[in-house]
């Protein structure tokens, strides 16, 4: 066991928050300010991320973990680890290359981010539109038109058959 250990890379003993310093006989040196190592055995420490400008610091950098950023109000995170901040739009809008634009008729967006999506097509489910859609809200689908005929109810028995040519009163 001892022989195996001696053959190991001496750097493997360096814990997170340190690096294996080649300039000092491979001893474990603490990460310098503004840097970190999140795993053991590293030969260099990584530069801390800065959260400036549109970014805000959510978590400070430490010797063992990178800083974490979020976005200033009016912007939201995009990408892994909030690598970008994208402009918020109002509900009923979507972000285009030219800025925030209102949703086209027949589409909606109920969030401050993302794209406008088409209103639900109620008829595809055999239903009718109960509440019309807006730029900010999807349509609300209701019962199918057939379900809305007078007397129609899940508890009433079906109406007696009528002679052809007669419509319901």
């Amino acid at each position: 066991f001892e022989r195996t250990r001696s053959l190991q890379d001496p750097c493997s003993n360096c814990p997170a928050g340190t690096f294996c310093d080649n300039n000092r006989n491979q001893i474990c040196s603490p990460c310098p300010p503004n840097s970190f190592s999140s795993a053991g055995g590293q030969r260099t420490c990584d530069i801390c991320r800065q959260c400036k400008g549109v970014f805000r610091t959510r978590k400070e950098c430490s010797s063992t973990s990178n800083a974490e950023c979020d976005c200033t109000p009016g912007f939201h995170c995009l990408g892994a680890g909030c690598s970008m901040c994208e402009q918020d739009c109002k509900q009923g809008q979507e972000l285009t290359k030219k800025g925030c634009k209102d949703c086209c008729f027949g589409t909606f967006n109920d969030q401050k981010r993302g794209i406008c999506r088409p209103w639900t097509n109620c008829s595809l489910d055999g239903k009718s539109v109960l509440v019309n859609g807006t730029k900010e809200r999807d349509v609300v689908c209701g019962p199918s038109p057939a379900d809305l005929s007078p007397g129609a109810s899940s508890v009433t028995p079906p109406a007696p058959a009528r002679e052809p040519g007669h419509s319901p009163q």
């Epitope: 310098p32 300010p33 503004n34 530069i47 991320r49 800065q50 400036k52 400008g53 549109v54 970014f55 200033t72 009016g74 912007f75 990408g79 690598s83 970008m84 901040c85 994208e86 402009q87 800025g99």
Partner: antibody, heavy 118, light 110 residues
Framework: QVQLQESGPGLVKPSETLSLTCTVS????????WSWIRQPPGKCLEWIGY???????NYNPSLKSRVNISVDTSQNQFSLKLNSLTAADTAVYYC????????????WGQGTTVTVSS | QSVLTQPPSASGTPGQRVTISCSGS????????VNWYQQFPGTAPKLLIY???QRPSGVPDRFSGSKSGTSASLAISGLQSEDEADYYC???????????FGCGTKLTVL
């Protein structure tokens, strides 16, 4: 690799508005800050302002009332407007990319000389 | 005029080591990493050191940076004639939410 190119008039009259454009080629404008810096003859570098690709802006307080920076991601360009010019605005104007991780200005345009004179 | 303070000039002979200082305050250097730029006459500045002590690819290891408290320094070892240029320090300033520069140090190789 990414290159920046400033364009605009070399001579502007006092009280007029300076309009400069920086075209980004060889890379995307997304996920970086885009800065304007100027250098009057024989003087220091002065940060004018920056715009983040998604529209967030910030300006040097000493110039804030006269400056507007905008971005056109579809054209891969960003622009500077500086109004109410005086002779003190005579300078070489640089555009630069500011990295959004460590915030160094890692790519610069070659600069354009702007003279304010009647 | 500049928020960061640099000596206006520095000099050295070929092969020597020279250092250029840059001092600021808690709102800039004290709380943020420092970047250094090299500028030759008639050309744009070039990023030389970022995040206190990191060299972009292509920058010789003769150039090194350090920071302590509200001051930073750029060291050039094995000075060469082609190092004659202006050197600027820069750091983010939290009160501005933007970068501030030093006024530059003109390095002369004697």
């Amino acid at each position: 690799q990414v290159q920046l190119q400033e364009s605009g008039p070399g001579l502007v009259k006092p009280s007029e508005t300076l309009s400069l454009t920086c075209t980004v080629s060889g890379g995307s404008i997304s996920s970086y800050y885009w800065s304007w810096i100027r250098q009057p003859p024989g003087k220091c570098l002065e940060w004018i302002g920056y715009i983040y690709y998604s529209g967030y802006t910030n300006y040097n307080p000493s110039l804030k009332s006269r400056v507007n920076i905008s971005v056109d991601t579809s054209q891969n360009q960003f622009s500077l407007k500086l109004n109410s010019l005086t002779a003190a605005d005579t300078a070489v104007y640089y555009c630069a990319r500011t990295h959004s991780y460590y915030y160094g200005m890692d790519v610069w345009g070659q600069g354009t000389t702007v003279t304010v004179s009647s | 005029q500049s928020v960061l303070t640099q000596p206006p000039s520095a000099s050295g002979t070929p092969g020597q080591r020279v250092t250029i200082s840059c001092s600021g305050s808690s709102s800039n250097i004290g709380n943020n990493p420092v970047n250094w730029y090299q500028q030759f006459p008639g050309t744009a500045p070039k990023l030389l050191i970022y995040s206190n002590n990191q060299r972009p690819s292509g920058v010789p290891d003769r150039f090194s940076g350090s920071k302590s408290g509200t001051s930073a320094s750029l060291a050039i070892s094995g000075l060469q004639s082609e190092d004659e240029a202006d050197y600027y320090c820069e750091a983010w300033d939290d009160s501005l939410n933007g970068p501030v520069f030093g006024c530059g140090t003109k390095l002369t190789v004697l």
